[in-house]
């Protein structure tokens, strides 16, 4: 009957392991895009929103060509752990305006956790150190207002979307080199 649903497939093929991480990343990317679009429909955004506590975007011009697998996986895992904290914070402190998106935020959190587990597995298979974040974890205080939580949600979903795009592109590029 095969392994139970959701359990990692045992494999010694790094390409297959990478493939399964890419699949989860792409699924999460699609979910994030959909949720960001819902957010824009319900709470139209006026321009770009940022949040100081979010990780800086991992990719800039020229960096993709020189990527190495350990660096990508470590950076991705650290960044996604930060986004997971931010999604948890949104669900906890987002206030009544974001309550309507609770099922979607819950599903997004579950997918993020699943991807993080898969990355952890991949890193242990490749004998990579499970790095802790370099920068100290900034405590997330309650949003200043209802509008503040909406702006934070736009920033979190937008940043996560771009981070996941970087991840898919980086991981697929690395797969071609394996």
């Amino acid at each position: 009957p095969g392994p139970p649903a959701g359990s990692p497939r045992v494999s010694s093929d790094p390409r297959a392991d990478l493939d399964s991480a890419v699949l989860l990343t792409r699924s999460l990317l699609a979910d994030t895009r959909q949720l960001a679009a819902q957010m824009r429909d319900k709470f139209p955004a006026d321009g770009d929103h940022s949040l100081d506590s979010l990780p800086t975007l991992a990719m800039s011009a020229g960096t993709l060509g020189s990527l190495q697998l350990p660096g990508v996986l470590t950076r991705l895992r650290v960044d996604l752990m930060s986004y997971l904290r931010h999604v948890q914070w949104l669900r906890r402190a987002g206030g009544p305006s974001l309550k309507t998106l609770e099922p979607e935020l819950g599903a997004l959190q579950a997918r993020l956790e699943r991807l993080l587990r898969r990355l952890q597995l991949l890193m242990s298979r490749l004998a990579l150190p499970q790095a802790a974040p370099d920068q100290p974890v900034i405590p997330l205080g309650p949003p200043a207002s209802a509008w503040g939580s909406i702006r934070a949600a736009h920033a979190i979903l937008g940043g996560l979307h771009l981070t996941l795009d970087w991840a898919v592109r980086g991981l697929l590029l690395l797969k071609t080199r394996l």
């Epitope: 990343t25 898919v168 592109r169 590029l173």
Partner: antibody
Amino acid sequence: EVQLVQSGAEVKKPGASVKISCKASGYTFTDYNMDWVKQAPGQRLEWIGDINPHQGGPIYNQKFTGRATLTVDKSASTAYMELSSLRSEDTAVYYCARGELGHWYFDVWGQGTTVTVSS
Amino acid sequence: DIVLTQSPASLALSPGERATLSCRASKSVSTSGYSYIHWYQQKPGQAPRLLIYLASNLASGVPARFSGSGSGTDFTLTISSLEEEDFATYYCQHSRDLPPTFGQGTKLEIK
């Protein structure tokens, strides 16, 4: 209306370089990747590479690595593709196309730029 | 790289008939829940136009007579009842891995 408008046709000598522009309008430029596709006479369409306008990080088809350079000017919502060391096989129509993040399907295309390489 | 082979190379049909175009991949382009195949239409002197994405999703503004199906290595684009403006060349494309590649095309001609 969502549109990609490309620069005009070019005629170049072998060994030269060409730089094509692609001006986006009608959507948020940084919400999609910009991809470039080559269509040579009698050949199948060929993906050259793409760039994420938000972060500026390009990726390339290995076949074009080292000769193609993709850049963006975010403030002008314009993407560029430069192709160097031109040879006759580079004679083709080059398209820019809007790419869905992480999925590489292209839902909006420029009108194409014809590049002719001839001595 | 994944190679996509389209068949037939050309097809002559009359308006009102049903068209079935095939695309076969050299390895599976599906993974649980997703099939990374997309279909485009191109007319002479024009850019390609996206018809179907992720195997079966109709792109914005595309008539409902177009549909896509398949999984694994075998995919089909179906036009249920041909209209005059449907006579063109059709390409499939995958995005399962990098680089994305295209099929060689199927030319749909008026009989």
